[in-house]
């Protein structure tokens, strides 16, 4: 079954390669088990950026690898991922299930256009 | 450096499937970002999948994304690729190649630093 999630269009990730953004989902019924997941859609590519699955007022346990982090509080998942370049400039886009329990829901996001400027090096002082 | 070798590749009629083998050995297989390439005739090495050291994230290239699977099997020291909805612009040579890095937003351009010496799949019309 289908449901809405929304995520906000535009975020400037932080001089230290840092981007936050909110992902809100219109939760149909009392789901106590979510999974969310950061896509990265750019390059002509897919790329599965970060996973969580938490329970419903608990923290977000993210799988291997992650360079994400996060929290929930009610239908709204607050991510940050980290480590971000200029390369990496592109569109993520939050999918949200809710696993548990029955029916299953999905939800994705129109996504988050994520703008990354590499910060310019230190002049060398004397 | 981990060693490669790929299996499975063979030829095919459009809209059939293969599924491709990718075995490794020589360091810990489970340190390794895993990406299956391709390079079909007279064109650049492609980026078609790639999987995280655990199994659980994926990347994939728009062109397979929907017919291709990746999958990987630690215990055994196995990479994989599923091939299902073959077209003839899917003919071309399968790598496999390992990245010793964790994961990113970009694993099509990790330093991938061990290849397969690929296999040839053949979509005929």
């Known amino acids: 079954k289908a449901m809405h999630v929304a995520q906000p269009a535009v975020v400037l990730a932080s001089s230290r390669g840092i981007a936050s953004f909110v992902c809100e989902y219109a939760s149909p019924g009392k789901a106590t088990e979510v999974r969310v997941t950061v896509l990265r859609q750019a390059d002509s590519q897919v790329t599965e950026v970060c996973a969580a699955t938490y329970m419903m007022g608990n923290e977000l346990t993210f799988l291997d690898d992650s360079i994400c982090t996060g929290t929930s509080s009610g239908n709204q998942v607050n991510l940050t991922i980290q480590g971000l370049r200029a390369m990496d400039t592109g569109l993520y886009i939050c999918k949200v299930e809710l696993m548990y329990p029955p029916p299953y829901y999905l939800g994705i996001g129109n996504g988050t256009q994520i703008y990354v400027i590499d910060p310019e090096p230190c002049p060398d002082s004397d | 450096e981990v060693q490669l070798v790929e299996s499975g590749g063979g030829v095919v009629q459009t809209g059939g499937s293969l599924r491709l083998s990718c075995a490794a050995s020589g360091r810990t297989f489970s340190m390794y970002t895993m990406g299956w390439f391709r390079q079909a005739p007279g064109k650049d090495r492609e980026f078609v999948a790639a999987i995280s050291r655990s199994g659980g994230l994926k990347a994939y290239a728009d062109s397979v994304l929907g017919r291709f699977t990746i999958s990987r099997d630690n215990a055994n020291e196995m990479a994989y690729l599923q091939m299902n909805s073959l077209n003839p612009e899917d003919t071309a040579v399968y790598y496999c190649?390992?990245?010793?890095?964790?994961?990113?937003?970009?694993?099509?351009?990790?330093?991938?630093?061990?290849w397969g010496q690929g296999t040839q799949v053949t979509v005929s019309s």
């Open positions: 190649a390992a990245a010793p890095v964790p994961w990113g937003t970009r694993p099509s351009h990790f330093t991938y630093d061990s």
